[in-house]
Amino acid sequence: IVGGQEAPRSKWPWQVSLRVHGPYWMHFCGGSLIHPQWVLTAAHCVGPDVKDLAALRVQLREQHLYYQDQLLPVSRIIVHPQFYTAQIGADIALLELEEPVNVSSHVHTVTLPPASETFPPGMPCWVTGWGDVDNDERLPPPFPLKQVKVPIMENHICDAKYHLGAYTGDDVRIVRDDMLCAGNTRRDSCQGDSGGPLVCKVNGTWLQAGVVSWGEGCAQPNRPGIYTRVTYYLDWIHHYVPKKP
């Protein structure tokens, strides 16, 4: 997370850390708890060549990475079938946990938005994660969860910005309909935040608007952060994840 600050302990109870096996269970992406047994993340975190179940664990909301780990096993990794690269889209995946999480005030699910929600500019939105704090600058110990408030940008404006200084023709969309833009040169998500949630407060309820997906660098001029637009994939999500009663 570029800019922003350490998150208060009471906030973002749906935030999770994805861990990969190595010399230690290393954080590599974020995710969000959308059901007691399901995590939403980015497809590029776990695909297109899907990792072994044995290589992956989920850590629920913790203030500092690695300090009080209780890693959870995953029983299924579901990558969106249309995913190939984040830039092309469909950068979304689901992880099913072996056991449902015991929800509490500290750990609970985030609400998915209604299909009609567009998340217009001016909406109060935040992105969270344990990723880099600037380009090629790692989050330092004790690895606190960070948060930053990011401005939403309309897709057509974001697309126009991404064409500045790019070889892509103006008639070729860079920012697609299944994407959402947010951030500026002082506030952005970054490497290691991928898969984590962009949430917006709508009528008093936090809704997950996006999944951290891609961008050219972090907090670069004319290069806002790009997120997978959750509303675009609600049907796909609910094909697997039970709706709340």
Epitope: H21, K51, D52, L53, A54, S75, R76, I77, E98, E99
Partner: antibody
């Protein structure tokens, strides 16, 4: 001592049913995913089913789906395999095994129990 | 489903020989697991996460590989190594084992 002891095997007619049990001791049974593996006479190992620590997730080999049911009773430290509509090709030694908590290999195996399906 | 194919199915070797068993997965996996089984006995964990030796396994055993192709190697075969070896993946369900490689005395 960490131990798994299977029981319940025996001779059963085709179409019949049998319930295998696996008694666990020497470790906190409720912390571990558990697996049944079988081995037909003179053949190789075949994975049968998996159950997660709290029973929320179960998976079966395709040929066992709909006929076999894996379950567990953590209060009794016991794993079960209910086998229905048995066929001659289900004849095998059935092993109960524990999935290692961190590394997912099957680190503790029972001695096996022989199931013979024959008329 | 991922299929596992071991080769050879059996091999004859002498004490002191270097022996290599291969296991090929039908699609890419991160890790391979190996088990040793002797006649009339339960299988024993032998190698996990491709190259880590299970407790009590002698250092003459090693494991390697990535993607779809993995190997178990015995640098100098000893009398107690004559057994059947099975590979297994833990990529996704259903789990599958290889058909086994029987190492016999020449």
């Amino acid at each position: 001592e960490v131990q798994l002891v299977e029981s319940g095997g025996g001779l059963v007619q085709p179409g019949g049913s049998l319930r295998l049990s696996c008694a666990a001791s020497g470790f906190t049974f409720s912390d571990y995913g558990m697996v049944w593996v079988r081995q037909a006479p003179g053949k190789g190992l075949e994975w049968v089913a998996f159950i997660s620590s709290g029973s929320s997730t179960v998976y079966y080999a395709d040929t066992m789906k709909g006929r076999f049911t894996i379950s567990r009773d953590n209060s009794k430290n016991t794993l079960y395999l209910q086998m229905n509509s048995l066929r001659a090709e289900d004849t095998a030694v059935y092993y109960c095994t524990r999935r290692n908590y961190d590394d997912y290999y099957f680190d503790v195996w029972g001695q096996g129990t022989l199931v013979t399906v024959s008329s | 489903d991922i299929q596992m194919t071991q080769s050879p199915s059996s091999l004859s070797a002498s004490v002191g020989d270097r022996v290599t068993i291969t296991c090929s997965a039908s699609s890419s996996v991160t890790y391979m697991y190996w088990y040793q089984q002797k006649p009339g006995k339960s299988p024993k964990p032998w190698i996990y996460r491709t190259s880590d030796l299970a407790s009590g396994v002698p250092s003459r055993f090693s494991g390697s590989g990535s993607g779809t192709d993995f190997t178990l190697t015995i640098s100098s075969l000893q009398p107690e190594d004559f057994a059947t070896y099975y590979c297994q993946h833990y990529h996704s369900y259903p789990l599958t084992f290889g058909q086994g490689t029987k190492v016999e005395i020449k």
